[in-house]
């Protein structure tokens, strides 16, 4: 299949990746969906190095990412492994509060105002940030 | 000169099936998620189905999931529409559209459209 | 799912008139809403964006307001192409079920 070799207008490439920034906000499924529909995925942070670049873009500003845990356990969007892989929860989450009012806990994840992570309500519209990966081959099945 | 056109439309009896093309033309078509929108006689525009630019993520309008299909082919530059066990109710104009989201264009909005092709689904 | 509700559902007016259409979401859109105009015949055409942005090429006569649930477009002194029929869509879900109000039509009166 045909491979993406640089970003589209708008994305911001880093280590291979494109990334896109909204500047409005939506609930974590429709945000889920506006990425799919990039062909890309809400961001999986998968080192420090990549948490301080979506930092630095995203300033202190609520922002989805791509993990949740609306079927139970935690999961990235992309299949990555959560429970080895790299998180920056803040101080006591996620707690999968239940004190909103709002119906239910808390199942999707969001950087905070100081880029650590929180659990929330899915429903809140949040900015968020679609991820693609560079060379990644299409989806596309190769001309014969 | 930015264009669609849709064919394939016609009479079709109830449980039959039918396939809808798209051509595009003036842009670059894989870079944009496509989708078909429809028209009953005298009502207003309904949502079908879109799939993005690799044809790789896929979403259909309840009235339609599991009876319609959604697919591309970029080397033709060509969206279609697979529609089976056909119902009066489906009896619309389909139009297709490029979907352009804000992370492309100024806007989320269906920005091009074709001239339409009319199914008609009657015994 | 969001419905969108659109008034009048007909409206007749005389070329040079002020016109006003309203659109009402269910909840809260931000300013997650577009505006086509479709005449007899032919496809929709985008003519408003995000609330108020005008689609290249728009005639400035046209104009949107709005915010949160509820929004306005106006044609300010409507000349003769103008008689057509006006769809409010919202994009705050991104899959479009449902999405578009049910239409204004603009008759000559």
């Known amino acids: 299949g045909s491979e993406r070799t640089c970003c589209p207008v708008n994305w911001v490439e880093h280590e291979r990746s494109c990334y896109w920034f909204s500047r409005s906000g939506k609930a974590w499924a429709d945000a889920d969906n506006y990425c799919r529909l990039e062909d890309a995925h809400l961001v999986v942070v998968t080192s420090w190095e990549e948490q301080k670049f979506v930092q630095h873009h995203i300033g202190p500003v609520n922002t989805w990412m791509g993990l949740h845990d609306q079927n139970g356990p935690w999961k990235w969007v992309d299949g990555t492994d959560y429970e080895t892989g790299f998180k920056n929860w803040r101080p006591e989450q996620p707690d999968d509060w239940y004190g909103h009012g709002l119906g239910g806990g808390e199942d999707c994840a969001h950087f905070t105002d100081d880029g650590r992570w929180n659990d929330d309500v899915c429903q809140r519209p949040y900015r968020w940030v679609c991820e693609t990966e560079l060379d990644k081959a299409s989806q596309e099945p190769p001309l014969l | 000169e930015v264009k669609l056109l849709e064919s394939g439309g016609g009479l079709v009896q109830p449980g039959g099936s039918l396939r809808l093309s798209c051509a595009a033309s003036?842009?670059?078509?894989?870079?944009?998620?496509m989708s078909w929108v429809r028209q009953a006689p005298g009502k207003g525009l309904e949502w079908v189905s879109v799939?993005?630019?690799?044809?790789?993520?896929?979403f259909y309008a309840d009235s339609v999931k599991g009876r319609f299909t959604i697919s591309r082919d970029n080397s033709k530059n060509t969206l279609y529409l697979q529609m089976s066990s056909l119902r009066a109710g489906d009896t619309a104009v389909y139009f297709c559209?490029?979907?352009?989201?804000?992370?492309?264009?100024?806007?989320?909005?269906?920005?091009?459209w074709g001239q339409g092709t009319m199914v008609t689904v009657s015994s | 799912d969001i419905q969108m509700t659109q008034s009048p559902s007909s409206l007749f007016a005389s070329v040079g008139d002020r016109v006003t259409i309203t659109c009402r979401a269910s909840?809260?859109?931000?300013?997650?809403l577009n505006w086509y105009q479709q005449k007899p015949g032919r496809a929709p055409k985008l003519l408003i964006y995000?609330?108020?942005s005008l689609q290249s090429g728009v005639p400035s006569r046209f104009s949107g307001s709005g915010s949160g649930t509820d929004f306005t477009l106006t044609i300010n002194s409507l000349q003769p192409e103008d008689f057509a029929t006006y769809y409010c869509?919202?994009?705050?879900?991104?899959?479009?079920?449902?999405?578009f109000g049910r239409g204004t039509k603009l008759e000559i009166k």
């Open positions: 869509q919202q994009t705050y879900n991104i899959l479009p079920e449902r999405s």
């Open positions: 559209a490029r979907y352009c989201s804000s992370a492309r264009c100024p806007y989320d909005a269906f920005d091009i």
């Open positions: 003036g842009f670059t078509f894989n870079n944009y998620a």
């Open positions: 909840q809260s859109i931000s300013d997650y």
């Open positions: 799939l993005s630019g690799s044809g790789g993520s896929t």
């Open positions: 995000d609330t108020s």
